[in-house]
C-alpha cells in the first residue's frame, strides 16, 4: 500500500482515482471501517469519524475522477490506513505524522542546549538529520541534542526526518541569544571620552530584563559594579551608578555606555551582564579598557599604558618623522634627555598602531 | 490620523496647582511613551517629563522634580500632567508630544499655555 | 545633563539657498538625535530621527547627518515655508535635551 508522510498541523491530500473520469460514488473511511466522508450525487457527505470538522474534498475534481481526502491541521492520532472505495474497488493509502519540537522554546542562551524531539506514531521507525545553519549535521532517532549552543547556530534548522524510503522536512527557526562580540577592547589617551557598546545579536520585539556592568580595574583589588540597570520593552533606565567613574547611559538598543573620560585608574577589564525575563542564564560580554599617558617631567620622558595589553604589543617612544628611540613589550618606556620636537608614543600589534599620544619636549635653554 | 489635544492651562498664583491632560487620538496610545515639553515666552524648548508605554516608567527635568507628576489613564487614552507648587519660570505653553517605536517625539499638540503670576 | 550647542544661533538666506545648521553634543550620543522645525506661534514639527532618517512626508530636500558629538541638519534648497526655527534634540538618555535654536531668516 502507498505510504504518506505528514507534518503535524500541517494539512495532506490523499488522492483517489477512478478510472472513469466523472463523478461517481466514493467513500473514504479509516482502518476501523468507520467513514470519514464520500459524496451524494453533488453533494460532500460526513462520516461520524473524528476527523469530521478537519476533513474535506475538492469537489471540482470529482468530474475528472479524482476524489482525494484533505486532512487539515494533522495530529499525530491521525496516523493511520485510509481507505478510498470507489468502482467497488479499494485503495489502501497509510498515512503516517511526524512532529518535531524544540524542547522547551526556541530562544535560548549562549552555551545552553537544544533538544529536540520527535513525535511519531506507534509502530514507526524513523531516523533523524537535522542541518544546522552553519551547516553541521546531526542524527538521532525520536530525540537530538546539541550541547554548548553557539551564535552560528542561529537561524533555521532543516530537519529531515525518513521512514519507509520517504521523507518528510522540517524547518525549525532557531534564536541564539547572545551578544555580536564576547569580547572587546577599546584603547584611549588619557582624558579622552570612552565609549562602550554591546550590541545584541539578535532581534526580538519586546525584550525585557536587567543588567550590570562589574569592572575590575587593573589598580584594584577587587571589582565593583559600575552600573545596573533594567530592560523594559527594549527601553533601558537605569537604576545605580557609581559617583566615580560616573557612566552615562543610553536609554536605547543597542546598550551604550559613555564613560567622560579615560584614566589609568579605571584602565581594566568589565563584564557586562543581561538576565533576560523568563530565560535562566545570562549573557555576557567582555569589555577592556587600555590607557595611554605621555609624561615629561624634568629630562625624563616617559610613556605608560595601563590595562590588559597582550605580551606581544610594542610600545614605544619616537621623535615625528624619525625611527623609534626606544620600542620595548613593557607597559611603560621612557627617554632621557629627549631632543626638542614632537614627540609620539606609540601602542602597536605587528606594525599596526592601535593607540598614539602627543607630546611636545620644548628645547632647553 | 494621529491627534494629540491638550488642555488644562490657565491663570495661576505662584504656589497653586494646575493639572493639564492630553487627549490622544489616531493610535495605540498604550504602546507607546508620551512626553511633555514646554516652551517659556521667546526662549526655547524644555523637556519636562516622560512615560514609557504600558509599563509607566516616569522620568522628570530637574527643574520640575518633586513638583510636577505625570500620568496615563490608557483606557481613557489621556495624558496628565499634575502641576504643584507653581512658580513664575513655570510659566510656558506645554506641548503634549507622542514617542514613536524608536522613541523620538514624532507628533505634537498645539499646546496648552500655563501662567503664573501674582 | 548632556548640553547640546547649536550654531549659528541665527542666520539669514535666500530662497534656493543651500542651509547647514550644526549641533554637538557634550558627550557622545551616538546617532540619537533628532531635529525638529517651529515656526513663530506654532507646535513644533518633527523633522528627522536617528540622525539621518526623515520621518514620513517630510521634503526630501531635508537631510541630517552625523554620529558621536557632532551633527549636521542640511536643507539642500531654502524653501519660503522653511524659514523658522530649527532645534537638536539629543534622545540618547534623559533628562531629553534640546540645542538653543537656529533662527533661519529671509535675506
Known amino acids: 500500500k502507498k505510504v504518506v508522510l505528514g507534518k503535524k498541523g500541517d494539512t495532506v491530500e490523499l488522492t483517489c482515482t477512478a478510472s472513469q473520469k466523472k463523478s461517481i460514488q466514493f467513500h473514504w473511511k479509516n482502518s476501523n471501517q468507520i467513514k470519514i466522508l464520500g459524496n451524494q450525487g453533488s453533494f460532500l457527505t460526513k462520516g461520524p469519524s473524528k476527523l469530521n470538522d478537519r476533513a474535506d474534498s475538492r469537489r471540482s475534481l470529482w468530474d475528472q475522477g479524482n476524489f482525494p481526502l484533505i486532512i487539515k491541521n494533522l495530529k499525530i492520532e491521525d496516523s493511520d490506513t485510509y481507505i478510498c472505495e470507489v468502482e467497488d474497488q479499494k485503495e489502501e493509502v497509510q498515512l503516517l505524522v511526524f512532529g518535531l519540537t524544540a524542547n522547551s522554546d526556541t530562544h535560548l542562551l549562549q552555551g545552553q542546549s537544544l533538544t529536540l524531539t520527535l513525535e511519531s506514531p506507534p509502530g514507526s521507525s524513523p531516523s533523524v538529520q537535522c542541518r544546522s545553519p552553519r551547516g553541521k549535521n546531526i542524527q538521532g532517532g525520536k530525540t537530538l541534542s546539541v550541547s554548548q549552543l553557539e551564535l552560528q547556530d542561529s537561524g533555521t534548522w532543516t530537519c529531515t526526518v525518513l521512514q519507509n524510503q520517504k521523507k518528510v522536512e522540517f524547518k525549525i527557526d532557531i534564536v541564539v541569544l547572545a551578544f555580536q562580540k564576547a569580547s572587546s577592547i577599546v584603547y584611549k589617551k588619557e582624558g579622552e571620552q570612552v565609549e562602550f557598546s554591546f550590541p545584541l545579536a539578535f532581534t526580538v520585539e519586546k525584550l525585557t530584563g536587567s543588567g550590570e556592568l562589574w569592572w575590575q580595574a587593573e589598580r584594584a583589588s577587587s571589582s565593583k559594579s559600575w552600573i545596573t540597570f533594567d530592560l523594559k520593552n527594549k527601553e533601558v533606565s537605569v537604576k545605580r551608578v557609581t559617583q566615580d567613574p560616573k557612566l552615562q547611559m543610553g536609554k536605547k538598543l543597542p546598550l551604550h555606555l559613555t564613560l567622560p573620560q579615560a584614566l589609568p585608574q579605571y584602565a581594566g577589564s568589565g563584564n557586562l551582564t543581561l538576565a533576560l525575563e523568563a530565560k535562566t542564564g545570562k549573557l555576557h560580554q567582555e569589555v577592556n579598557l587600555v590607557v595611554m599617558r605621555a609624561t615629561q617631567l624634568q629630562k625624563n620622558l616617559t610613556c605608560e599604558v595601563w590595562g590588559p595589553t597582550s605580551p606581544k604589543l610594542m610600545l614605544s617612544l619616537k621623535l615625528e618623522n624619525k625611527e623609534a628611540k626606544v620600542s620595548k613589550r613593557e607597559k611603560a618606556v621612557w627617554v632621557l634627555n629627549p631632543e626638542a620636537g614632537m614627540w609620539q608614543c606609540l601602542l602597536s600589534d605587528s606594525g599596526q598602531v592601535l593607540l598614539e599620544s602627543n607630546i611636545k619636549v620644548l628645547p632647553t635653554w | 490620523e494621529v491627534q494629540l489635544l491638550e488642555s488644562g492651562g490657565g491663570l495661576v498664583q505662584p504656589g497653586g496647582s494646575l493639572r493639564l491632560s492630553c487627549a490622544a487620538s489616531?493610535?495605540?496610545?498604550?504602546?507607546?511613551?508620551m512626553s511633555w515639553v514646554r516652551q517659556a515666552p521667546g526662549k526655547g524648548l524644555e523637556w519636562v517629563s516622560t512615560?514609557?508605554?504600558?509599563?509607566?516608567?516616569?522620568y522628570y527635568a530637574d527643574s520640575v522634580k518633586g513638583r510636577f507628576t505625570i500620568s496615563r489613564d490608557n483606557s481613557k487614552n489621556t495624558l496628565y500632567l499634575q502641576m504643584n507648587s507653581l512658580r513664575a519660570e513655570d510659566t510656558a505653553v506645554y506641548y503634549c508630544?507622542?514617542?514613536?517605536?524608536?522613541?523620538?517625539?514624532?507628533?505634537w499638540g498645539k499646546g496648552t499655555t500655563v501662567t503664573v503670576s501674582s | 545633563a548632556i548640553q547640546m550647542t547649536q550654531s549659528p544661533s541665527s542666520l539669514s538666506a535666500s530662497v534656493g539657498d543651500r542651509v547647514t545648521i550644526t549641533c554637538r553634543a557634550s558627550?557622545?550620543?551616538?546617532?540619537?538625535l533628532g531635529w525638529c522645525q517651529q515656526k513663530p506661534g506654532k507646535a513644533p514639527k518633527f523633522l528627522i530621527y536617528?540622525?539621518?532618517t526623515l520621518q514620513s512626508g517630510v521634503p526630501s530636500r531635508f537631510s541630517g547627518s552625523g554620529y558621536g558629538t557632532d551633527f549636521t541638519l542640511t536643507i539642500s534648497s531654502l524653501q519660503p515655508e522653511d524659514f523658522a526655527t530649527y532645534y537638536c534634540?539629543?534622545?540618547?538618555?534623559?533628562?531629553?535635551?534640546f540645542g538653543q535654536g537656529t533662527k533661519v531668516e529671509i535675506k
Open positions: 512615560i514609557s508605554d504600558n509599563i509607566g516608567n516616569t
Open positions: 536617528a540622525a539621518s
Open positions: 534634540l539629543q534622545d540618547y538618555n534623559y533628562p531629553r535635551t
Open positions: 489616531g493610535f495605540t496610545f498604550s504602546t507607546y511613551a
Open positions: 508630544t507622542k514617542d514613536n517605536e524608536d522613541y523620538y517625539m514624532d507628533v
Open positions: 558627550q557622545g550620543i551616538r546617532n540619537d
